[in-house]
């Protein structure tokens, strides 16, 4: 029986050109997290595997950084980044938990969760 719940940042907005941290949190279960997938609609952004570490999809490599923790940081946001993002937690023995975040990228200055990482 799956007892866990996923908490996400929910609906968030950020400024065009800015940064955002996407975070999900799995609670209320003792299941071991074996992998977390981050997806944008049907497109894979990144995988965080407990044994293999991070894999960032090549098309996002220059503006995505892993972390903090199992989260994901998106940089240099464009209006095209507006949409649904999913964190998919693969766990043992529970199975799969999915969380949803809706990101709206705005032209105005309504940025949240500004990230501190830099990619030269």
């Amino acid at each position: 029986m799956m007892t866990g719940t996923i908490e996400t940042t929910g609906n968030i907005s950020a400024e065009k050109g800015g940064s955002i941290i996407l975070q999900c949190h799995l609670s209320s279960t003792t299941a071991q997290v074996t992998q977390v997938n981050w997806e944008q609609q049907d497109q894979l952004l990144a995988i965080c595997n407990a044994d293999l570490g991070w894999h960032i999809s090549p098309s996002f490599k220059d503006r995505v950084a892993p972390g903090p923790g199992l989260g994901l940081t998106l940089q240099s946001l464009t209006v095209n980044d507006t949409g649904e993002y999913f964190c998919i937690y693969h766990t043992y023995p529970d199975g799969t938990y999915t969380g949803r975040i809706f990101l709206e990228v705005l032209e105005s200055s309504v940025a949240e969760h500004g990230a501190r990482f830099q990619i030269p």
Partner: antibody, heavy 117, light 107 residues
Framework: EVQLQQSGTVLARPGASVKMFCKAS????????MHWVKQRPGQGLEWIGA????????NYNQKFKGKAKLTAVTSASTAYMELSSLTNEDSAVYYC??????????WGQGASVTVSS | DIVLTQSPATLSVTPGDSVSLSCRAS??????LHWYQQKSHESPRLLIK???QSISGIPSRFSGSGSGTDFTLSINSVETEDFGMYFC?????????FGGGTKLEIN
């Protein structure tokens, strides 16, 4: 087997700079953050910053911005930390550790830096 | 920055005792809390990840609990090899931070 091999002991003068290394083996170097942690004698652990070799992303503790510079040579699976304008307060053991999202699961043996005139 | 406060600073116990070490965060960090053990003149070692998840190779007498701001590392029947320093660390937000540590010593 995952291993993080760090530089040896360094003795430096106040005002000088030192660059230490952390050579990784046994895993995909570009898939993990490399963290650097400071420990003064008899004290706790202090997070300096981290470098992600996958795309050269960095994150610093504000306290160490301007003091520590983190870099890496991916082809050599080696991370570096340069400490500048050394003072007695920089005398410590410095650890590198890797993190792939699930805690810092492997640590180097530590590199000792002593600043003395 | 998130401040992690560990208590007690020192804990004197007898082998065979069961103990609890506390780590309190200055704001909610959900379950993004990890525990490390450091023996004298050694590097830290990861004991527990994400507040309660076990680590391969770590004895089952070590367990973790908590969420939000209050976390506990429990050692069921302390053995002599368990004496040393214990640190908590958060990965909820940058910059990562460590607690000040709890020293577990022989009574």
């Amino acid at each position: 087997e995952v291993q993080l091999q760090q530089s040896g002991t360094v003795l430096a003068r106040p005002g000088a700079s030192v660059k230490m290394f952390c050579k990784a083996s046994g895993y995909s170097f570009t898939s993990y953050w490399m963290h650097w942690v400071k420990q003064r004698p008899g004290q706790g652990l202090e997070w300096i910053g981290a470098f992600y070799p996958g795309n050269s992303a960095t994150n610093y503790n504000q306290k160490f911005k301007g003091k520590a510079k983190l870099t890496a040579v991916t082809s050599a699976s080696t991370a570096y930390m340069e400490l500048s304008s050394l003072t007695n307060e920089d005398s410590a053991v410095y650890y590198c550790s890797r993190e792939g999202g699930y805690g810092m699961d492997h640590w180097g043996q530590g590199a000792s830096v002593t600043v003395s005139s | 920055d998130i401040v992690l406060t560990q208590s007690p600073a020192t804990l004197s116990v007898t082998p065979g005792d069961s103990v609890s070490l506390s780590c309190r965060a200055s704001q909610s960090i959900r379950n993004n809390l990890h525990w490390y053990q450091q023996k004298s003149h050694e590097s830290p070692r990861l004991l527990i990840k994400y507040a309660s998840q076990s680590i391969s190779g770590i004895p089952s007498r070590f367990s973790g609990s908590g969420s939000g701001t209050d976390f506990t590392l429990s050692i069921n029947s302390v053995e002599t090899e368990d004496f040393g320093m214990y640190f908590c660390q958060q990965s909820n937000s940058w910059p990562y931070t460590f607690g000040g540590g709890t020293k577990l010593e022989i009574n």
